[in-house]
């Protein structure tokens, strides 16, 4: 930054409120597409463009002019593997966080004309093309149909769709929130021959129901009903096919062949939560008890003899937990070897710490190719002769990411392969590898601005740079921005993480207010490297707040002995962790300890909620955004996973303890600002309804705002402005800032 | 290399049953469907009937009563069968690969005379 | 049962001639139609599948089109090997059912 240290003699101006809103600094992306091993697809002025990844020429793939004529806004663009087609997606309609109906239309690159005849129907809910060739599956009013060329009719594949009750090659509300976080539940295998696809059954599922008021026109409101399984209700049940797409007729129906659960699984209550084509005769599944500390793989193979898929129990793998539940979210995807018969996995090792393990089909243990106190985030890619993944070792800052190679041969052999590339701008990476693995795009997000470079993995030389954010860089230096600080304090001998936002200027001799911006959840983790223009920014650099945020007990990435401390107990140590360090923070000598404040959105709703409830008088005021309340009102598959079943046999005894409601009474001692989405398909509306109840009971004055048919991300662009302006003269006024 | 090699034709006797093999290689009958069609001499093509990959069957009314189509997946082996067979059998039979909705290999033909 | 009439049962052309070749369905079966060569030796193979989409090795001069009732089958250049009877033949619907055939010849 240029200007000086004394702020009063910096003439720029700060990072306001309308910057953010309006996204005046705009961070640039390199958001590319790869179509083969060594070419991919990028987007420029509405050129696609095709680029040569040794040498960086480019060409153009196709003209921003070629659909002119159209008459539809195309929302998005897919080319088929052979880069025949372009399927066009326009007409989109969104419905929860991954799913939407779309139109589509093919255009042939050959003859550049659109197909015209056998047109994917309108509100299709999914399509896909095969890892191969042209084929493309579909799904439209819940069945999954085929097509074997884009101008020939489609092969229908199931019949028993039937809207918010049985779901083929699609996901249901729960399974697509918590398990695939995705709308799709088809998955070709790698040549194209066969379609595997899960099928839900939600008849016996609860609905949710909450009004939508539309237009002001509408007299009526109408009545959303949604299947959402909330804890310990009836869940969806789930069944596993596959088909040959080469035996498709159109006078005869599809056989789809079912894999079912193992036998471990279909005692009880159950999830299918991974499927993974192994070769492309060979595929695996993971299943998941309800109590998700038990999960099984199975590997199953085509038998060609018979047109049947067999797995043996031999080759059955079994994951579980005893601290907690299996995987961070869910169990880890298996990353096989070219000929099937291995596979890598990320699991818990002996200490608590998510590392690869190297497991052969047919041997029950497995063989850890990383250890220590850090964990593996996510394999990458896997070659003949190197592993690639993403980890939090380098430095020991579990809030860093890099990306490193280890030799198959000899897994003593690893290399970090961007911690030296640029380490004071650069500790948060992510990457994107080409189709076999020769390039890689590596996408640096902080501490600086962000940074695109292409690689080549040869020799893992830097080939170019893709964006710099320059221009960008350029317009904040004539910003007093803030700087983040990330460091950790020591607690029952334990290192915990927390980051700062300081504003400009900071001086450590003067007391500032302070924002703790909460998320908390299992596996959060909300102290990182990273960059980030957003209300924090605002806060720090025009407010002179200082917004930090802290990952306590159940936070991620730092081994199990801290993320599992929550099992059972949600509501309680990651509680008591935010309010411990807003303790930690005032000593610090730089706090203004009459004036800290708290927020969170959906489970930081929660914990700021109950925070703000503990009676702890460290906070003035707090804000929750779509807060759960009380863990019966949200979902199955989420709040079971870290709370057990609202039993008395199992854990009714802490979901009663651990509601917002019970604390109302401690309500009165802060200031409170409650907001939620009326159409909140996920944290229901009724979350925050309760607490309002329950403070109106008891007397307590507090302020509230219901976004009228927002869901839980209240994103649309009135409502965005309109929340982050209100809680804005919150936290002002709870400050008394001018 | 996709192949169906045919064979049992020959000279029959009306009223005797007559059994026609077709032995796929490069694909597995348990994916694809065979078909068997006919050709009388200097006559057009006539459709018999098919058996699918999982097994199901279909046939032509004409041919209900006395014709079926099996398979012995093990053998990569379709067969037809034909009983009570009468002059007007007298064709070359074709078996031939389901693809989708066309048959995209054919056999070689056998043929068949039913002559007293 | 769907009737397929082709015409002409017979035709005679010269190399190099623009040759076509009609089939009609007694019933609308939009694009399911296929269209099949008979080589004198008896030996069938697919030349045009779901109308005009050209099978895999099949020269580019034959060419299919239509839907509905009416198709067509295109030969644009004519080589000697293209000798054969031509048959067309509907997939929508069971029984499947065949063109009463076309035989070209070379004049």
């Known amino acids: 930054n240029k200007g000086t240290d004394d702020a009063t003699a910096d003439s720029r101006k700060t990072y306001t409120l309308t910057d953010y809103l309006k996204n005046t600094y705009r961070l640039k992306l390199y958001s590319l597409r790869w179509i083969s091993d060594h070419e991919y697809l990028y987007k420029q002025e509405n050129n696609i463009l095709v680029f040569n990844a040794e040498y960086g020429n480019s060409s153009v793939f196709l003209e921003n002019s070629t659909f002119d004529e159209f008459g539809h806004s195309i929302n998005d663009y897919s080319i088929s593997p052979d880069g025949q087609f372009i399927l066009l997606e326009y007409n989109y309609v969104k419905q929860w966080r991954h799913s939407y109906t779309a139109s589509y239309d093919i255009y042939d690159l050959n003859k550049r004309q659109l197909i015209t005849e056998e047109r994917i129907p309108n509100n299709t809910q999914w399509v896909t093309w095969s890892p191969v060739g042209h084929k493309l599956a579909y799904v439209w009013n819940n069945d999954i149909y085929v097509k074997i060329e884009p101008n020939l009719p489609s092969y229908r594949i199931t019949w028993t769709g039937k809207e918010d009750i049985i779901y083929n090659g699609i996901t249901d509300w729960v399974y697509e929130e918590e398990v695939f976080s995705a709308y799709s539940a088809l998955w070709w295998s790698p040549n194209g021959t066969f379609l595997a696809y899960a099928q839900f059954n939600d008849t016996e599922v609860p609905l949710i129901e909450y009004s939508f008021y539309s237009d002001e026109s509408l007299q009526y409101p109408k009545t959303v009903r949604v299947p959402y399984p909330k804890a310990g209700a009836v869940n969806p049940t789930v069944k596993f096919f596959v088909v040959n797409t080469d035996s498709l007729s159109s006078v005869t129906n599809a056989t789809s062949i079912q894999i079912t659960a193992p036998a471990s699984m279909l005692i009880g209550d159950h999830y299918l939560c991974d499927v993974t084509w192994a070769t492309q005769e060979r595929i695996s599944l993971q299943w998941l008890r309800r109590i998700q500390n038990y999960s099984v793989m199975d590997i199953c193979d085509y038998d060609e003899s018979s047109g049947r898929w067999n797995c043996l129990v031999a080759r059955q793998h079994i994951e579980m937990s005893t601290t907690g539940w299996v995987g961070r979210f869910r169990p880890s995807e298996p990353h096989f070897t070219l000929d099937g018969n291995s596979f890598y996995k990320i699991i818990s090792n002996e200490e608590g710490y998510r590392h690869i393990c190297y497991f052969q089909i047919d041997k029950k243990d497995c063989t850890f190719i990383t250890k220590g106190t850090w964990e593996v985030i996510g394999i990458e890619a896997l070659t003949s002769d190197y592993l690639y993944y993403i980890s939090n070792e380098y430095k020991g800052m579990p809030g860093g990411r890099n990306l490193y190679k280890i030799q198959l041969s000899d897994y003593t052999k690893v290399t970090c392969l961007s911690c030296e590339l640029n380490p004071e701008r650069c500790q948060y990476y992510s990457v994107s590898f080409s189709k076999e693995a020769k390039y890689y795009q590596l996408r640096c997000s902080g501490p600086g601005l962000p940074l695109y470079t292409l690689h080549s993995s040869v020799n893992d030389k830097g080939l170019r740079v893709l964006e710099d954010n320059s221009a960008l860089d350029k317009m904040l230096q004539n910003v007093q921005m803030p700087s983040k600080k990330l460091d950790f304090i020591i607690l029952n001998e334990t290192k915990f993480w927390y980051q700062m936002i300081l504003p400009p200027h900071f001086d450590k001799s003067k007391k500032y207010p302070l924002l703790l911006d909460v998320y908390a959840g299992p596996c959060s983790q909300k102290a990182d490297t990273v960059f980030r223009l957003n209300w924090a920014t605002y806060l720090a650099s025009t407010e002179n707040i200082i917004v930090a945020s802290f990952d306590g007990r159940g936070s991620g990435y730092q081994g199990d002995k801290i993320m599992h401390a929550i099992n059972r107990r949600l509501g309680t140590f990651e509680v008591e962790d935010q309010i411990e360090a807003a303790r930690q923070f005032s000593k610090m000598g730089f706090v203004d300890n009459k004036r800290i404040a708290i927020w969170g959105w959906s489970y930081g709703g929660y914990v700021t909620s109950m925070v703000l409830g503990s009676g702890s008088g460290v906070f003035k005021c707090g804000i929750a955004v779509a807060p759960v309340s009380r863990w019966e009102y949200y979902d199955s598959v989420y709040t079971e996973r870290y709370m057990g079943l609202p039993t008395p046999e199992d854990n009714l005894d802490h979901y009663r303890n651990s509601t917002v409601m019970s604390r109302a009474e401690n309500f009165k001692q802060v200031e409170y600002l409650l907001i939620h989405g009326t159409a909140d398909d996920n944290v229901h509306f009724q979350q925050s309804a309760q607490i309002s109840k329950a403070l109106v009971d008891v007397g307590v004055d507090f302020q509230a705002m219901w976004y009228t048919d927002e869901d839980h991300g209240i994103a649309s662009s009135t409502a965005h402005q309109h929340i982050y302006t209100h809680m804005s003269h919150f936290i002002k006024q709870c400050f008394s800032l001018p | 290399e996709v192949q169906l090699v045919q064979s049992g034709g020959g000279v029959k006797q009306p009223g005797e049953t007559l059994r026609l093999t077709c032995t796929a290689s490069?694909?597995?009958?348990?994916?694809?469907?065979v078909h068997w069609v006919r050709q009388a001499p200097g006559k057009g093509l006539e459709w018999v009937g098919v058996?699918?990959?999982?097994?199901?069957?279909d046939y032509d009314a004409a041919f209900m009563s006395r014709v079926t189509i099996s398979k012995d997946t093990s053998k990569s082996t379709a067969y037809l069968q034909m009983n009570s067979l009468r002059a007007e059998d007298t064709a070359v039979y074709y078996c031939?690969?389901?693809?989708?909705?066309?048959?995209?290999?054919w056999g070689q033909g056998t043929t068949v005379t039913v002559s007293s | 049962d769907i009737q397929m009439t082709q015409s002409p049962s017979s035709l005679s052309a010269s190399l190099g001639d623009r040759v076509t070749i009609t089939c009609s369905a007694s019933?609308?079966?939009?694009?399911?139609l296929n269209w099949y060569q008979q080589k004198p030796d008896g030996a069938v193979k697919l030349l045009i599948y779901?109308?005009?989409n050209l099978h895999s090795g099949v020269p580019s001069r034959f060419s299919g089109s239509g839907s509905g009732t009416d198709f067509s089958l295109t030969i644009s250049n004519l080589e000697p090997e293209d000798i054969a009877t031509y048959y067309c033949?509907?997939?929508?619907?069971?029984?499947?059912?065949f063109g009463s055939g076309t035989k070209l010849e070379i004049k």
């Open positions: 031939m690969r389901n693809r989708h909705d066309w048959f995209d290999y």
């Open positions: 490069g694909f597995s009958l348990t994916t694809y469907g």
């Open positions: 033949q509907q997939s929508i619907k069971l029984p499947f059912t």
């Open positions: 019933q609308g079966i939009r694009n399911s």
């Open positions: 058996i699918w990959g999982d097994g199901r069957t």
């Open positions: 779901y109308s005009s």
